[in-house]
Structures are given as structure tokens and as C-alpha cells.
Interface confidence: low
């Protein structure tokens, strides 16, 4: 069990999404509509995991990690590639260890095999990511 | 109830290719993935590859790659793998499971993958001259 | 061989409790979680415990699993002779990008 003073997360999970992150934690009730908070029963460290695909970056998951582990030392959500579900789109992830830090993200690095989207750094959207 | 229901014992020669199919009954099969596993006799699990039947993305292991190829049907809720170029070291069960990662093709859970929960009943495959 | 590390053995008598252990690397168990299953021997796998330490519907809450860093454990207590199988752990591994099994721990109920 975490510490009492819990780490709170932003959670969400796209439609379609199996298998649920939410036992990771305890809902916190933000008003309607997302985003929603998750305080996190078993680490310090949120995640947040997002699609990005032909330019645009679409959040997939939000939430709590189960256990402390590398990465969530970072005040941030820097994501990284890690895998790639098609040859036109790559999922990016972060972890970061403060409240609400994975929200969003300042800036997707190159994605590898990505094809190339155009001539800027790809970005959610002005304000952040597209939620579904 | 949820089932998977594998296609049946197969001998084959060294070089020849081998196709199983694996149907699914009791769920809408577009909502998940299916993986395919073998074991070789009296060893361990091996994971061969997965398909999202949703949208036909695959992921295969990297020793079978070029060698192996998933597909899906989803007229007839039925999954297949063949595998080319058979060796004598192929002989195994070849197993089919649902898979708990998403059928939507969002990918991998991740940090958060549920495994696998519905398994066939396997189909031997012997390759022998 | 396995990536993943398991004892190929492990014996108790019924009522007992037994741990099984996996042992991985910082590409898999310590950055994914992990799954274990259960074979019976002529038998396709079950599985037993998803995300570390969850139970499907229909396991006995006497099989429970953990997680710490980049090794995992599977607890069986009070065993009974039907758990007499083969026991598998699993992860994601992100260097492979695919998914690994441990080679399996035959677990033997005496008496």
C-alpha cells in the first residue's frame, strides 16, 4: 500500500478500451465530462499514454501506475515511443510522479518509423490532447 | 459460454507450410485480440504473434517473422495461422486465446495487459519425413 | 531459453503454502505487468492471475500474485491436491516487443 499522502492522476480511457486501469485507484469526482482524477492506491506515478496518427495525437489512457518504477521520478510527461500498431501511427507514453502531470505533454519526439507528418513537431492540438 | 475451438492433429513434411484455424463462439470477436502460443513436447510456452480482430493489425515474434502469417474472418468469428517452411523443431501444440489487449487496434495495454483468458484446446502439429 | 526465470520445480503438502518466483529484467516484469497460468498437465493453459495481482471470476482467492521491481512471485495457500500443474508467468517485453513466458514450474502436492 502507498503512502497516505496519495498521488492524484488524471484518468481516462478511450471507448473500446478492455481492461480497465480504474482499480488502480479511487475516482475523484471533477464535475462532468473528462477530464476525471484518480488518486493512486499502489504508487506515486501517473501515466498517460497517446496515439498518434498521420499528425494528430489522439489520448488513449490516463491514469495510475501499479507500482513505482523507472521514469516515474519525472516532474513531467515526456512521452516516448513505444510501439507501433500500424506503419501510420505510433503510441507515445509518459510517467511522471507529481499531481496531474499527465495531463499533457509539451511536445512528441520523432517517432522512429513513423512516416513523416510535415514540416512541424507534431502536437495534440493547441491546448492539448483530443479527448474522445 | 466463451469458447475457442481449434481444427485438427496435422502431419506434415519438412519445408511444407500448415494452416489452423481457431473459431470463436460465446463473444463478439471483433472486441478482442486473439494470440497464438506453441509447446514444443515436454517444454515450456512459447508466444508466436497476435492479430487484432478488429482491424486485422498483427504483431509477430521476431524468430517467426517471414515465416509466420495471422489472419482473421469475421464473417465466420474464425482466426487462422500458417506457418511456412516447416522444421522438424515446429512440431508442437499450437495453441489460439483470446486476448485481453484491445480488439480496436489502440495496441498493447501497455502497463495494463490483462492476458490471456480463453484458451483453445490446441492442435498438434508434427513435421516428420 | 525462457526469458523470463522460474524454478523448474517446487513440492508442498496439502494445506501448506507454496511461493513460485519469476525473475525478469527491467524490459519486461520491471516496466509491465504480469500474468500467470496454470496447466494441467494434457491440458490447454488457464490463466490465473492478470496485472500482478488479479484474480479472473472462478480463482479461488487461495492463488495470489505480486510484483516488485523486476521479479514477480505467484502464492498458493492451502494447498490442494488439484493444484498439482504447471505454472507459467508472462510479461510484455518492450525490447522484444512481444510477449514472454517463464519456462514453467512444476509444482508436485505430496502426500
Known amino acids: 500500500q502507498v503512502s497516505p499522502n496519495r498521488r492524484t492522476c488524471v484518468f481516462f480511457e478511450a471507448p473500446g478500451v478492455r481492461g480497465s486501469t480504474k482499480t488502480l485507484g479511487e475516482m475523484v469526482d471533477a464535475g462532468p465530462g473528462p477530464p476525471k482524477g484518480i488518486r493512486c492506491l499502489y504508487s506515486h506515478c501517473c501515466f498517460g499514454i497517446w496515439n498518434l496518427t498521420h499528425g494528430r495525437a489522439q489520448v488513449e489512457m490516463q491514469g495510475c501506475r501499479d507500482s513505482d518504477e523507472p521514469g516515474c521520478e519525472s516532474l513531467h510527461c515526456d512521452p516516448v515511443p513505444r510501439a507501433h500498431p500500424n506503419p501510420s501511427s505510433t503510441l507515445f507514453t509518459c510517467s511522471c510522479g507529481t499531481d496531474f502531470c499527465n495531463a499533457n505533454y509539451s511536445h512528441l519526439p520523432p517517432s522512429g518509423n513513423q512516416g513523416a507528418p510535415g514540416p512541424q513537431e507534431p502536437q495534440a492540438t493547441p491546448g492539448g490532447p483530443v479527448w474522445m | 459460454q466463451v469458447q475457442l475451438v481449434q481444427s485438427g492433429t496435422e502431419v506434415k513434411r519438412p519445408g511444407a507450410s500448415v494452416k489452423i484455424s481457431c473459431r470463436a463462439t460465446?463473444?463478439?470477436?471483433?472486441?478482442?485480440?486473439i494470440s497464438w502460443m506453441r509447446q514444443a513436447p515436454g517444454q515450456g510456452l512459447e508466444w508466436m504473434g497476435w492479430?487484432?480482430?478488429?482491424?486485422?493489425?498483427?504483431n509477430y515474434a521476431q524468430k517467426l517473422q517471414g515465416r509466420v502469417t495471422m489472419t482473421t474472418d469475421t464473417s465466420t468469428s474464425t482466426a487462422y495461422m500458417e506457418l511456412r517452411s516447416l522444421r522438424y523443431d515446429d512440431t508442437a501444440v499450437y495453441y489460439c486465446?483470446?486476448?485481453?489487449?484491445?480488439?480496436?487496434?489502440?495496441?498493447?495495454?501497455?502497463?495494463?495487459?490483462?492476458?490471456?483468458?480463453?484458451w483453445g484446446q490446441g492442435t498438434t502439429v508434427t513435421v516428420s519425413s | 531459453q525462457p526469458v523470463l526465470t522460474q524454478p523448474p520445480s517446487a513440492s508442498g503438502t496439502p494445506g501448506q503454502r507454496v511461493t513460485i518466483s519469476c525473475s525478469g529484467s527491467?524490459?519486461?516484469?520491471?516496466?509491465?505487468?504480469v500474468n500467470w497460468y496454470q496447466q494441467v498437465p494434457g491440458m490447454a493453459p488457464k490463466l490465473l492471475i492478470y496485472?500482478?495481482?488479479q484474480r479472473p471470476s472462478g480463482v479461488p482467492d487461495r492463488f495470489s500474485g505480486s510484483k516488485s521491481g523486476t521479479s514477480a512471485s505467484l502464492a498458493i495457500s492451502g494447498l490442494q491436491s488439484e493444484d498439482e500443474a504447471d505454472y507459467y508467468c508472462?510479461?510484455?517485453?518492450?525490447?522484444?516487443?512481444?510477449?514472454?513466458f517463464g519456462g514453467g514450474t512444476k509444482l508436485t502436492v505430496l502426500g
Open positions: 527491467r524490459s519486461n516484469i520491471g516496466r509491465n505487468t
Open positions: 486465446a483470446r486476448d485481453g489487449r484491445r480488439g480496436s487496434g489502440i495496441y498493447w495495454g501497455v502497463y495494463y495487459y490483462n492476458g490471456m483468458d480463453v
Open positions: 492479430i487484432s480482430a478488429y482491424n486485422g493489425n498483427t
Open positions: 460465446g463473444y463478439t470477436f471483433s472486441d478482442y485480440g
Open positions: 508472462a510479461a510484455w517485453d518492450d525490447s522484444l516487443n512481444g510477449v514472454v
Open positions: 496485472s500482478n495481482n
